[in-house]
């Protein structure tokens, strides 16, 4: 029952919480049989997905699966958002579910007053 359809193994509602300033690799697991498909990453902007053509990508080949990787070196605060990989295979376009990156900006997080601080010193809210 093994099919030779290209499969992209990104699950619905998948997400990653990452820190700004760190390196990060976003993986698109790809199964193919003979010829490796052409795979791209895009970032969702509303209902359209904007192709990331100028970003560093690479392939990692393992025994039964390959990974098309989008590199973030380093992660920037505006990398926050949803991404999708797509494979072109025999003139068919196969799209993955979107995967969401939640980027924490370490700099602003360290400057932000804690919940306890805000409770005991409410004027901090109005600094």
């Amino acid at each position: 029952k093994e099919s030779c359809d290209v499969q992209l193994y990104i699950k619905r509602q998948s997400e990653h919480s990452i820190l700004a300033g760190d390196p990060f690799e976003l993986e698109c697991p790809v199964k193919y049989c003979a010829n490796r498909p052409h795979v791209t990453w895009c970032k969702l902007n509303g209902t359209t997905c904007v192709k990331l053509e100028d970003r560093q990508t690479s392939w990692k080949e393992e025994k039964n699966i390959s990974f098309f990787i989008l590199h973030f070196e380093p992660v920037l605060p505006n990398d926050n958002g949803s991404y999708r990989c797509s494979a072109n295979f025999q003139s068919n376009l196969i799209e993955s579910h979107s995967t969401t990156l939640y980027v924490t900006d370490v700099k602003s997080a360290s400057e932000r007053p804690s919940k306890d601080e805000m409770a005991s010193r409410p004027w901090l809210l109005y600094r």
Partner: antibody
């Protein structure tokens, strides 16, 4: 050949915890795309999806029962476990595990024979 | 949750005749990835469910080609071109596009 078999206690009293085991063969839960779901069916009624565990240990639950459910796997022994806390008579049903295969998303291509639970005081 | 409604509740068919079951969803099952995750199962009397069709129209392995699935959006149909005795049981549609995954109430196929 893919097979799945459920096992459970058969009878529980209200407020007890239900522990179910799905033992399977013919596939590995470490393979990309593979998963196992639990689905239940009260006698003479329809099907209700409960929970799913994916190849990478990611989990999804039916929100209507999420607070009472836990799902886990033992990949090396080809088993998936479901726990439901504080059972009630409404949990009386046949419980099935099903293999989640993948074609862009999960679909259930093989089902176990089911294990019956009766909750009664 | 997405509600799946099947009709008719019961279908009485003579062997060799065609049969058709309708399944409607309260939300579109067309996913943002372009696929429609609508599936069909058959539960024969006293047995566990068996997969028939996934992704609207793809026949699962070992399923005879007298079964065909069609539809889009919110309206779907399962057709049997010539009913055989082994086809009796309850047919369920279910959707895998939206969490939680949900099932139709079932259509019982009886042999006349």
């Amino acid at each position: 050949q893919v097979t799945l078999k459920e096992s459970g206690p058969g009878i529980l009293q209200p407020s007890q915890t239900l522990s179910l085991t799905c033992s399977f063969s013919g596939f590995s839960l470490s393979t990309f795309g593979m998963g196992v779901s639990w689905i239940r069916q009260p006698s003479g009624k329809g099907l209700e999806w409960l929970a799913h565990i994916y190849w990478d240990d990611d989990k999804r639950f039916n929100p209507s029962l999420k607070s009472r459910l836990s799902i886990s796997k033992d990949t090396s022994n080809n088993q998936v476990f479901l726990k439901i806390t504080t059972v009630d008579t409404a949990d009386t049903a046949t419980y099935y595990c099903a293999r989640g295969n993948w074609d862009g998303e999960t679909y259930f291509d093989y089902w176990g024979q089911g294990t019956t639970l009766t909750v009664s005081s | 949750d997405v509600v799946m409604t099947q009709s008719p509740l019961t279908l009485s068919v003579t062997i060799g005749q065609p049969a058709s079951i309708s399944c409607k969803s309260t939300q579109s099952l067309l996913d943002s990835d372009g696929k429609t995750y609508l599936n069909w199962l058959l539960q024969r009397p006293g047995q566990s469910p068996k997969s028939l069709i996934y992704l609207v129209s793809k026949l699962d392995s070992g399923v005879p080609d007298r079964f065909t699935g069609s539809g889009s959006g919110t309206d779907f149909t399962l057709k049997i071109s010539r009913v055989e005795a082994e086809d009796l049981g309850v047919y369920y549609c279910w959707q895998g596009t939206h969490f939680p995954w949900t099932f139709g109430g079932g259509t019982k196929l009886e042999i006349k």
